[in-house]
Amino acid sequence: IWELKKDVYVVELDWYPDAPGEMVVLTCDTPEEDGITWTLDQSSEVLGSGKTLTIQVKEFGDAGQYTCHKGGEVLSHSLLLLHKKEDGIWSTDILKDQKEPKNKTFLRCEAKNYSGRFTCWWLTTISTDLTFSVKSSRGSSDPQGVTCGAATLSAERVRGDNKEYEYSVECQEDSACPAAEESLPIEVMVDAVHKLKYENYTSSFFIRDIIKPDPPKNLQLKPLKNSRQVEVSWEYPDTWSTPHSYFSLTFCVQVQGKSKREKKDRVFTDKTSATVICRKNASISVRAQDRYYSSSWSEWASVPCS
Amino acid sequence: VPGGSSPAWTQCQQLSQKLCTLAWSAHPLVGHMDLREEGDEETTNDVPHIQCGDGCDPQGLRDNSQFCLQRIHQGLIFYEKLLGSDIFTGEPSLLPDSPVGQLHASLLGLSQLLQPEGHHWETQQIPSLSPSQPWQRLLLRFKILRSLQAFVAVAARVFAHGAATLSP
């Protein structure tokens, strides 16, 4: 058993049929010695008396808010949550496996630049009695600070018969060094509590591996005289790290016909302009990627040829 | 470059960008080892990293690029030695046309651009990683190239910025 926060405790249980469970001793936080009784949740049934209560925690029915009283007055509370371990693996019932980029991916994170700011998100089908708390650090043995905000519900989607809820959190490394080569990964830890079930999820990454620039901005076409060619130009996204002579991007320019089956013409360039042939009803799209490290491409910025 | 002269920024920029390309093309070819969730120890603690105080940021380069260039040179020599070691030359053999050979030569080329014959910066000892099994070599190749990708990305940014802002 360990303390999650004041008066909230997590009991770690090996979860299998007829498991013996864990013996837990609760102590009433009071100077009083006599006349103390214990109850669980809203029930008035007295579970025991005395300053300590010993219970055998085996299942969710044994978890909940234990309260010690004296003469009708509440002295203190202890909330017990359960953390299930099945076959040596902690349960992951609360969050959905996003399966990208690999199985058992519950947390996904992205950064728009090298400033040390990043966003993580996760999915669940649970709509109520759900709380999240997020902590982060750079490295684990001698951790350097990363500050995370509160997790918020950022999207709701309908998936078949189910509703899916997306939560996200923004974090910022306290002393980020954008130009340095990272040697210790960022660690992100999410505590999830659903009713009386506790679970924790972790992710470990380098900022360089989760970079995804915003799409190029101000995408414009300039027809070239007496030609089907156009000059496409664009700019670095505002959110990208500066100076651009140091934090350089590379770009992919694509000409795509109306039909998805039509052949796509693609050009790669380090410049912020390119000359392409504009076909009727086609569109021109541009996306960006770090020039020197193959992290994710940005989403496409697009304009119609006409 | 030692003694404060300026490097051939544009040449260094071109070669470092080539190194980036080679490091990424070599990576999947060293032998597939699916190591997603493995590696609770940092393999690359022993390798030289370009750290915050090394003056490789735009401001540090403007003030005095020598500290940064020395750090980059150290790293290039270090990785050049690793790529020439038993880790990459031992079993399992790399294919004759593997980009690792080009990568090795390019690391040497860039280090020589930074330190012509007759000048000497101190270099870092390469650690004894001592893989005795072929799959241990495979694992280390995988991790060394991952680490090299990060190192050459920073070096390429330094030379691109130098070529754009510090070239005479």
Partner: antibody, heavy 119, light 111 residues
């Protein structure tokens, strides 16, 4: 599909030599290492030695002086030679494929050949 | 040589229950964060078959009832739920150092 087939079975007199050939199909000896493993009747498994993709070998130190492994890539064959056999060398001898990307795990096994050392 | 000690030597489990087999190494078999420990199943009269490689990776075609965990010196093979077809002897093996040693085996039976 991947297959490994050992020659035999073999009956050997004590102090004599043993030769087994393993013929593989469905993969190339240029890309995979081969190990030999034996199992005495009713007992556990013992690794004997391996031949790498490049032709290098390594052997169980306890048997090194009596053991030799070689191969012919063009014929997809691996050879095990063992001399000075004693009765405790009686076992089922398996030819096994080792996968480097699996960390040297043995992902395909032959059906084994029975070797009996008896006078 | 690295000695691998498997326990228990034999195990009887009811159908649908969980079987846990332990393998302890005499020295660490981690190399830069990767554990070169593998698990095999050998049914009577058959050749061994790879189940788990590098401590926790399930070989393709093996049911997800089989799982491996552990690192350094302590490793576990779990079968949950056990089926009648799982009656066999299970071996652990390390390939971190040669000679590549096997555990003594654990015989699984149905109660």
């Amino acid at each position: 599909q991947v297959q490994l087939k050992e020659s035999g079975p073999v009956l050997v007199a004590p102090s004599q030599s043993l030769s087994i050939t393993c013929t593989v199909s469905g993969f190339s000896l240029n890309n995979f290492a081969i190990s030999w493993v034996r199992q005495p009747p009713g007992k556990g498994l013992e690794w004997l030695g391996a031949i790498w993709t490049g032709g290098g070998t390594n052997y169980n130190s306890a048997l090194k002086s009596r053991l030799s492994i070689s191969k012919d890539n063009s014929k997809s064959q691996v050879f095990l030679k063992m001399n000075s056999l004693q009765t405790d060398d009686t076992a089922r001898y398996y030819c096994v494929r080792k996968d480097y990307s699996y960390g040297g795990a043995m992902d395909y096994w032959g059906q084994g050949t029975s070797v009996t050392v008896s006078s | 040589d690295i000695a691998l000690t498997q326990s228990p030597a034999s195990l009887a489990v009811s159908l649908g229950q969980r079987a846990t087999i332990s393998c302890r190494a005499s020295e660490t078999i981690n190399f830069y964060g990767t554990s070169f420990m593998h698990w095999y199943q050998q049914k009577p009269g058959q050749s061994p078959k790879l189940l788990i490689y590098r401590a926790s990776n399930l070989e393709s075609g093996i049911p997800a009832r089989f799982s491996g965990s552990g690192s350094r010196t302590d490793f576990t093979l779990t079968i949950n739920p056990v089926e009648a077809d799982d009656v066999a002897t299970y071996y652990c093996q390390q390939t971190n150092e040669d000679p590549y040693t096997f555990g003594g085996g654990t015989k699984l039976e149905i109660k």
